[in-house]
Interface confidence: medium
């Protein structure tokens, strides 16, 4: 089954997820993997290089690249498809003669797959197709895995330990190198010294960009730094055993002097810049519930204080094939009810020291619009509406009907597809709106479908406030007020005048205002006034009145 694309180019968690780092998790470590092997420039190494005057240049590999692309995502940003790098473009390692910096603020060096890797190679040989962040084969961002000169082998199994890798490139390249893969799949260089090998490098050269893995012990809250070298090096003051420096406190610098019989003085002075403890960071879901159906917000929170410089901490996220380097990300225009996997990692001085993954299911979305089949009135006081339900999940319907300015709403069971409206007012236009809703993290209403009908006519109500007054001996003036409910299309007032059982007058006016003349004197009359709406007559209002004797 193919993954479901969202409007942002994310894919749902049904597809294989793309880890941030290329190496597998070491056995029995708790949650965090070593960072993938990146070729790095000297300025990104875990080192401060101190060189003697005789060592002022660095042999570099001459096959240069001049291709690069930079990601640009700043702030808490919405998803954009990033420009993908074709090659990592790290610069030549320097043994100290030249200085490398980034211009501008940290934000200008965004989302380099590894620090320095978006700097176009400007020296021969640094065609570093290093593992761009990430290198899982399913990722669209995958670049060819290079057998880097300094790839980290898988770390030994450690219970309750976290592996953190600080990778930089090996400054010194021997004349003859054999590249092999270690059991972990990482590249390892074994060097074979042959007649053409140059004279021994200084240890400062040889280990100029030694890579360091930091192992965090959650119980002791101390780090161990593992020096990624192929030979068992010696450390000044015996500070390391088996290429490991133990009991390092978070956020403290430690200086280690490294030497080996394969290299000459000066020794390599390695400054270990120890990261903060991993448990001081927590990945928090900051999604607003109102928007949880189409957005995801993730934010790293510092839940404890530490003394490391926070400016040296950078954050990376990968959700699907989208990559960001913000502390907080907001993904928008997602599909409701879909799972999205986001991997994140935190780097200290551009070296990963912790990561986390979250699978977030977006909330139920607003239901779709119901499809009204018909709505009509077949009687004066009744109406009917039938519909097809929307496709998406919902809990119930709300049916509202509006006459003039009055509005009534009903909650209807989700299984209903028809509703009979009762006690409607005759000959009245009703506007109906029907929407489905779902109660998720918040109630979400679907779009309303609208229809209208006019109820059938019915007899109007009685006229009221009828008066009969004598205007002369034989003339009467009959007036009344309109009915409260006309209940039909037309307006006509009727007056019937009876004497005994005989209809003596039958008049019809637009207004209820009748002047009845030439009546018999001294006679009892019955006056019946009623309203006719074009379809039905109303109940008559009846008054009795007598003419008087003629005054003459």
């Amino acid at each position: 089954q193919s993954p479901t694309p969202s409007p942002t180019g994310l894919t749902t968690a049904k597809m294989p997820s793309v880890p941030l780092s290329s190496d597998p998790l070491p056995t029995h470590t708790t949650a965090f993997s070593p960072a993938s092997t990146f070729e790095r420039e000297n300025d990104f190494s875990e080192t401060t290089t101190s060189l003697s005057p005789d060592n002022t240049s660095t042999q570099v590999s001459p096959d240069s690249l001049d291709n690069a692309s930079a990601f640009n995502t700043t702030g808490v940003s919405s998803v954009q498809t990033p420009h993908l790098p074709t090659h990592a473009d790290s610069q030549t390692p320097s043994a100290g003669t030249d200085t490398q910096t980034f211009s501008g603020s940290a934000a200008n060096a965004k989302l380099n797959p590894t620090p320095g890797s978006n700097a176009i190679s400007d020296v021969p040989g640094e065609r570093s197709t290093a593992s761009t962040f990430p290198t899982d084969p399913v990722s669209p961002l995958t670049t060819t895995l290079s057998l880097a000169h300094h790839s980290s082998a898988a770390l030994p199994a450690r219970t309750s330990n976290t592996t953190i890798t600080a990778n930089t490139s090996d400054a010194y390249l021997n004349a003859s190198e054999t590249t092999t893969l270690s059991p972990s799949g990482s590249a390892v260089i074994s060097t074979t010294t042959i007649a053409t090998t140059p004279s021994k490098p200084t240890c400062d050269e040889k280990y100029a960009n030694i890579t360091v893995d930091y192992l965090y012990n959650k119980e002791t809250k101390l780090f161990t730094a593992k020096l990624n070298v192929n030979e068992n090096v010696e450390c000044g003051n015996n500070t390391c055993t088996n290429n490991e420096v133990h009991n390092l406190t978070e956020c403290k610098n430690a200086s280690v002097s490294i030497s080996h019989n394969s290299c000459t003085a000066p020794d390599k002075t390695l400054i270990l810049d120890v990261p903060p403890g991993v448990e001081k960071f927590q990945l928090h879901d900051c999604t607003q519930v109102e928007k949880a159906d189409t957005t995801i917000c993730l934010k790293w929170k510092n839940i404890e204080t530490f003394t490391c410089d926070t400016q040296n901490i950078t954050y990376r996220f990968q959700c699907g094939n989208m990559i960001f380097d913000n502390k907080e990300i907001k993904l928008e225009n997602l599909e409701p009810e879909h799972e999205y996997k986001c991997d994140s990692e935190i780097l200290y001085n551009n070296h990963k020291f912790t990561n986390a993954s979250k699978i977030i299911k977006t909330d139920f979305g607003s239901p779709g619009e119901p499809q009204i089949i018909f709505c009509r009135s077949e009687a004066a006081h009744q109406g009917v509406i039938t519909w097809n339900p929307p496709q998406r999940s919902f809990h119930n319907f709300t049916l509202c009907y509006i006459k003039e300015t009055e509005k009534d709403c009903l909650n209807l069971d989700k299984n209903l597809i028809k509703y009979d409206l009762q006690n409607l007012k005759p000959y009245t236009k009703y506007v109906l709106s029907l929407h489905a809703y779902i109660i998720a993290k918040v109630q979400r209403n679907g779009s309303a479908a609208m229809c209208h009908f006019t109820t059938k006519s019915a007899p109007p109500s009685q006229v009221w406030n009828m008066t009969v007054s004598m205007t002369s001996d034989n003339s009467m003036h009959v007036k009344c007020r309109p009915p409260r409910d006309r209940n039909g299309p037309h307006e006509r007032y009727h007056l019937e005048v009876e004497a005994g059982n005989t209809l003596v007058r039958n008049e019809s006016h637009k207004n209820c205002d009748f002047r009845v003349k030439d009546l018999q004197y001294s006679t009892d009359y019955t006056f019946k006034a009623y309203f006719h709406n074009g379809d039905y007559p109303g109940e008559p209002f009846i008054l009795h009145h007598s003419t008087s004797y003629n005054s003459k």
Epitope: E41, S57, T58, Q59, V60, S61, P62, D63, S64, L65, D66, N67, A68, S69, A70, D89, Q91, T92, S94, T97, D98, Q100, T101, F102, S103, G104, N108, A109, N112, G116, N118, A119, I120, D122, V123, P124, G125, L173, A175
Partner: antibody, heavy 117, light 112 residues
Framework: QVQLQQSGAELARPGASVKMSCKAS????????MQWVKQRPGQGLEWIGY????????KYNQKFKDKVTLTADKSSTTAYMQLSRLTSEDSAVYYC??????????WGQGTSVTVSS | DIVITQDELSNPVTSGESVSISCRSS???????????LNWFLQRPGQSPQLLIY???TRASGVSDRFSGSGSGTDFTLEISRVKAEDVGVYYC?????????FGGGTKLEVK
């Protein structure tokens, strides 16, 4: 066609700073590094350093690292070099040059800087 | 730093003759990929440098076949056959194998 257009000549006093520009056109600015080279009157060429406009990554010749600041503006496809604390030693023509795979293939016309009190 | 040395030409060259310009590196510019990272430039009077030869012997686009480069890891020669008046200027060699990149001091060619 590829062109590198450098800003005009500068006359500055000792101790001052100057900032020159190199406007690139005719190619994708972010796909090549921009190199800077110094040539003192009647003398040879000296490599100052370069900037990768794509990432902002800079590498300096150690000799110039306290003298020069390189920047680039992707939106205007322009690279800049600022010289600070000028002395008479800084009087020279400064070239920007695009770096191809194995060579500096296109050069600007040069910006002349004269430091004089 | 790698030091690049260029010799001066003692006399102006007659138009139509051939001339060799030498360049020596303090360190081999042959890298393990088999390429030699030595480039030649010509800077005509009042102009910017122009690339002639790269990787020791490959002519740059648009450069006359009268120009050819050769050499070993440390000793290099730029050969100009049938010299023309337009060939006057200063010829520089440059190494790109190691930072900082360095140029030779230049060889001035005069044509009579």
């Amino acid at each position: 066609q590829v062109q590198l257009q450098q800003s005009g000549a500068e006359l500055a006093r000792p101790g001052a700073s100057v900032k020159m520009s190199c406007k690139a056109s005719g190619y994708t600015f972010t796909s090549y590094t921009m190199q800077w080279v110094k040539q003192r009157p009647g003398q040879g060429l000296e490599w100052i350093g370069y900037i990768n406009p794509s990432s902002g990554y800079i590498k300096y010749n150690q000799k110039f690292k306290d003298k020069v600041t390189l920047t680039a503006d992707k939106s205007s496809t322009t690279a800049y070099m600022q010289l600070s604390r000028l002395t008479s030693e800084d009087s020279a023509v400064y070239y920007c040059a695009r770096r191809g795979s194995y060579f500096f293939d296109f050069w600007g016309q040069g910006t002349s800087v004269t430091v004089s009190s | 730093d790698i030091v690049i040395t260029q010799d001066e030409l003692s006399n102006p060259v007659t138009s139509g003759e051939s001339v060799s310009i030498s360049c020596r590196s303090s360190k081999s510019l042959l890298y393990k990929d088999g390429k030699t990272y030595l480039n030649w430039f010509l800077q005509r009077p009042g102009q910017s440098p122009q690339l002639l030869i790269y990787l020791m012997s490959t002519r740059a686009s648009g450069v006359s076949d009268r120009f050819s480069g050769s050499g070993s890891g440390t000793d290099f020669t730029l050969e100009i056959s049938r010299v023309k008046a337009e060939d006057v200027g200063v010829y520089y060699c440059q190494q790109l194998v190691e930072y900082p990149f360095t140029f030779g001091g230049g060889t001035k060619l005069e044509v009579k």
